[in-house]
């Protein structure tokens, strides 16, 4: 999902320590930044979230807030501290004039300031059938485990807790943080105020139409009667959950955020903190028929972001708009005409559509998976959701052409059994943001903290790229792709896997002098090859064709163009075994694929040769896809021949561990 480069406005104001009365002036040269929502109508000027540096204590936050008030007062400005954050993010929420931003940015401990903005509800019986494996009858949907060990927090509108569908299952907390409704003549009607939240609570855990019929829920009101809330209100809600978790630790927690606003650095940061505290967050991708990376919390990498499909597994159209898409979406789920509790009466039911409904399905599935395996980490849960999804059923023609390759073709489904998936080596594909077109532009794809980066590839629509490589960043490997002169930009594609007790390293061979091409292998005892990458400095690799087939007995070897440096990802993990599988096509083809067989998981995907007519390589589920330039432009010379190279791995250790458990 989103890196650090979301599409939002950023005003960087250089700090100078000339402000009067600053006892703790920031170090010279540091800059605090100001952010605001890129969607103008959603901005809420006059209210600001001041985010302080990570290690700032509550007392320092309070002192900084007081200092801001004092200095503002000296300039004749009134300010009001609305909330002091602690427990999730250090900082405070302040109502003040925008004139004071420059002053506020110079305060000690300030990391960045974000103007508040709006968030919105994302809603406009086949659904249980789609997520249910064939062995369950849809009309008597009896989930294998109803999610009874899990608590699901719902941040939404108020709800009708005495509805027959959810009575006794939802605890309404006393948390409420909502903006005033728009319009002077707005009439609050209880049934309308409760509509969105009641429906979603029913989709998650309702007795008749719910996914996780055993899950208990807690509701927080962050959306008003018009389905509108604020980033700040959502932040305070997330902080409330974190504090509740600390006061009374329970079993696994799932937080459902069926709302979306413009890209928000602070909302994404809060989601990241909560996720790293062991909470599973599930959110709506958004109903804007747009790139989900432009919205929050959909763009937060730690959040499970869900798009909406219909009964035919097609992306949902909602009026002139529809489900969001793109690399920030993790998977899709039923989100059209979903039957659920209606707040019109305690025995009323109605259908609603949207990515909120889709997210509620995934929250329900997550609750059931966590109830069956309470020790699952967020990374393990996400990988399982992806693994058990229906693959390649969505008609990608609905998505804009440039988004098709980035959007996961996955529709959420329950595992055939909620136990016993532990033997599987789980991997997923993570796409970076687009690098941009400048000559030296790069793109970085990262895995989650407890995933291993097992391979790295790159892709460019123009074919102008300089390959990719794995490099260490902050103690973890990342995948970096390089744009080339005249290129329109590149994507880095990371293959992120769950490999307990793994010890992985990257072995590099510089460009070879000899004409045979560059080679690198895993020379350490017990290390196996999981991925190959190649990176070159020249603008065009030309047509040199290295030997495609490896010498017998050399499976742990990457080969590449003589002008490229070759990088081998070599891993040691208990019982890990890998093999190389190649599929070469002598005639030019726009796409060459090779898949790993049943029981093996694709960890590496690369192309041979690395010549410039190859657009790149990427993994789709268990298939390695190599894309080349339009056949008509390459002609039918030998340059058109391309080989897709897959590295397929499995873990005997995981398989044995799983057998011992059964």
């Amino acid at each position: 999902q989103e890196d650090e480069d979301g599409d939002y406005e950023e005003l960087v104001l250089a700090l100078r320590s000339e402000e009067d009365g600053l006892a703790e002036a920031p170090e010279h040269g540091t800059t605090a930044t100001f952010h605001r929502c890129a969607k103008d109508p959603w901005r809420l000027p006059g209210t600001y979230v001041v985010v302080l540096k990570e290690e700032t204590h509550l007392s320092q936050s309070e002192r900084t807030a007081r200092r801001l008030q004092a200095q503002a007062a000296r300039r004749g400005y009134l300010t009001k501290i609305l909330h002091v954050f602690h427990g999730l993010l250090p900082g405070f929420l302040v109502k003040m004039s925008g004139d004071l931003l420059e002053l506020a940015l110079k305060l000690p401990h300030v990391d960045y300031i974000e103007e508040d903005s709006s968030v919105f509800a994302q809603s406009i019986p086949w659904n249980l059938e789609r997520i249910t494996p064939p062995r369950y009858r849809a009309d008597e949907y009896q989930p294998p485990d109803g999610g009874s060990l899990v608590e699901v927090y719902l941040l939404d509108t108020s709800i009708q807790s005495d509805h027959r569908e959810i009575e006794g299952r939802v605890m309404v907390t006393d948390f409420e943080n909502v903006p005033e409704e728009d319009g002077t003549r707005f009439h609050r009607q209880a049934s309308k105020c409760d509509s969105h939240g009641t429906h979603l609570a029913g989709v998650v855990s309702g007795r008749d139409a719910g996914v996780a019929k055993g899950a208990s829920m807690r509701s927080l009101r962050v959306l008003n009667c018009q389905g509108k809330g604020t980033v700040s209100g959502t932040l305070i809600g997330l902080e409330f959950i974190r504090k509740s978790q600390l006061v009374q630790p329970v079993g696994p927690l799932v937080v459902l955020l069926p709302l979306a606003g413009g890209y928000s650095r602070v909302l994404n940061a809060a989601c990241q903190r909560l996720a790293r505290a062991g909470v599973v967050l599930v959110t709506a991708a958004g109903n804007f028929r747009d790139d989900a990376c432009l919205y929050s919390p959909a763009s937060a990498p730690e959040v499970i972001t869900v798009g909406a499909t219909n009964a035919q597994d097609q992306p949902v159209t909602l009026g002139t708009l529809g489900t969001n898409f793109g690399r920030c979406v993790d998977l899709f789920a039923p989100g059209e005409d979903i039957i659920g509790a209606s707040s019109d009466c305690s025995t009323c039911f109605v259908s609603q559509s949207g990515t909120s409904q889709a997210a509620a399905h995934v929250a329900g599935i997550a609750a059931m998976m966590l109830s069956a395996e309470p020790e699952l980490t967020l990374a393990e849960l996400r990988q399982r959701l992806i693994h058990f999804s229906a693959k390649d059923v969505i008609n990608e023609a609905w998505f804009p052409e440039d988004q098709r390759v980035l959007t996961p073709n996955l529709v959420a489904a329950l595992p055939p059994s909620t136990h016993g998936a532990g033997w599987q080596l789980f991997c997923r594909t993570v796409w970076s943001a687009h690098s941009g077109p400048t000559r030296m532009a790069t793109a970085v794809a990262r895995c989650a903290p407890d995933e291993e980066l097992l391979s790295c590839s790159s892709f460019s629509r123009s074919g102008k790229r300089r390959g990719e490589r794995m490099e260490a960043q902050g103690g973890k490997l990342v995948c970096r792709a390089h744009n080339a002169f005249g290129g329109e930009g590149v994507y880095a594609i990371a293959r992120c896997c769950l490999l307990p007790q793994a010890n992985c390293s990257v072995h590099t061979a510089p460009p070879a002098e000899a004409s045979m091409g560059t080679r690198v292998h895993c020379h350490q005892q017990g290390h196996v090859l999981t991925g190959c990458s190649s990176h070159w400095e020249v603008e065009d690799l030309g047509t040199h064709k290295p030997p495609v087939l490896r010498p017998r007995g050399q499976p742990n070897q990457c080969v590449g163009h003589r002008e490229a440096s070759i990088h081998a990802s070599c891993c040691h993990a208990p019982g890990l075994e890998c093999k190389v599988k190649e599929h070469g096509i002598p005639a030019p083809q726009e796409q060459v694929t090779v898949a790993c067989e049943e029981g093996w998981t694709l960890t590496g995907c690369s192309a041979l040769p690395g010549t410039s007519h190859v657009l790149g390589a990427y993994a789709v589920d268990n298939t390695c896809v190599v894309r080349s330039r339009d056949v008509s432009t390459t002609g039918s010379t030998s340059e058109g021949a391309v080989t897709a190279v897959a590295i397929c791995c499995r873990s005997r250790h995981l398989a044995q561990a799983s057998q011992e458990l059964q």
Partner: antibody, heavy 117, light 107 residues
């Protein structure tokens, strides 16, 4: 397969009592509201009573409230209808039904109760 | 109690015809309305719940519409097996109440 089987009804004297039972199978009984509906021969349907999942909440047709009691035993998957001070106008076929989406989606085959001297 | 009125006790139709049965509530019941089919000697069978949602396994020639006080049940093309009595029932507030039923017969 969802099944609802009512106990045998029969002929009873006016003023006497009778307890109907309905044995459920093929679904998680405790997850559903259950109801009794009756039908006078050649006439329409009349809802009698319903009961929530755990038996803590019941509703009745006003005119029957004082004489009929609906109850359930979730351990045995059985729904009951205790009828007392029976009158000739209680003569009907009694159906037990499961409620889903607040409508009655599965019905028993019905049992005939005749109140006559 | 909410009174449900099915104005036609009988409706005559021909096979293949489209037929609509109406039901009126004495007060607003939102969309909390179900339709049942009952054949002689059989228990009622749920067709439509919440005014317009077809229950599992019900053929798509059966549709329901309406909200508030006025509801309609439609069979788009009558088949021989559709000859039965059709009842509406509100599930807005207890006591649940049924309409008097409409018997569908062939002309």
């Amino acid at each position: 397969e969802v099944k609802l089987v009512e106990s045998e009804g029969g002929l009873v004297q006016p003023g006497s009592s009778m307890k109907l039972s309905c044995t459920a199978s093929g679904f998680t009984f405790s997850d559903y509201y259950m109801a009794w509906v009756r039908q006078v021969p050649e006439k329409g349907l009349e809802w009698v009573a319903n009961i929530n999942y755990d038996g803590s909440n019941t509703s009745y047709l006003d005119s029957l409230k004082s004489r009929f009691i609906i109850s359930r035993d979730n351990a045995k998957n059985i729904l009951y209808l205790q009828m007392s001070s029976l009158k000739s106008e209680d003569t009907a076929t009694y159906y037990c039904a499961r409620e889903k989406f607040a409508a009655m989606d599965y019905w028993g085959q019905g049992t005939s109760v005749t109140v006559s001297s | 109690d909410i009174v449900m009125t099915q104005s036609h006790k009988f409706m005559s139709t021909s096979f293949g015809d489209r037929v609509s049965i109406t039901c009126k509530a004495s007060q607003d019941v939102s969309n909390a309305l179900a339709w049942y089919q009952q054949k002689p000697g059989h228990s009622p069978k749920l067709l439509i719940f919440s005014a317009s949602y077809r229950y599992t396994g019900v053929p798509d020639r059966f549709t329901g519409s309406g909200s508030g006080t006025d509801f309609t049940f439609t069979i788009s093309s009558v088949q021989a097996e559709d000859l039965a009595v059709y009842y509406c029932q509100q599930h807005y507030s207890t006591p649940w109440t049924f309409g008097g039923g409409t018997k569908l017969e062939i002309k």
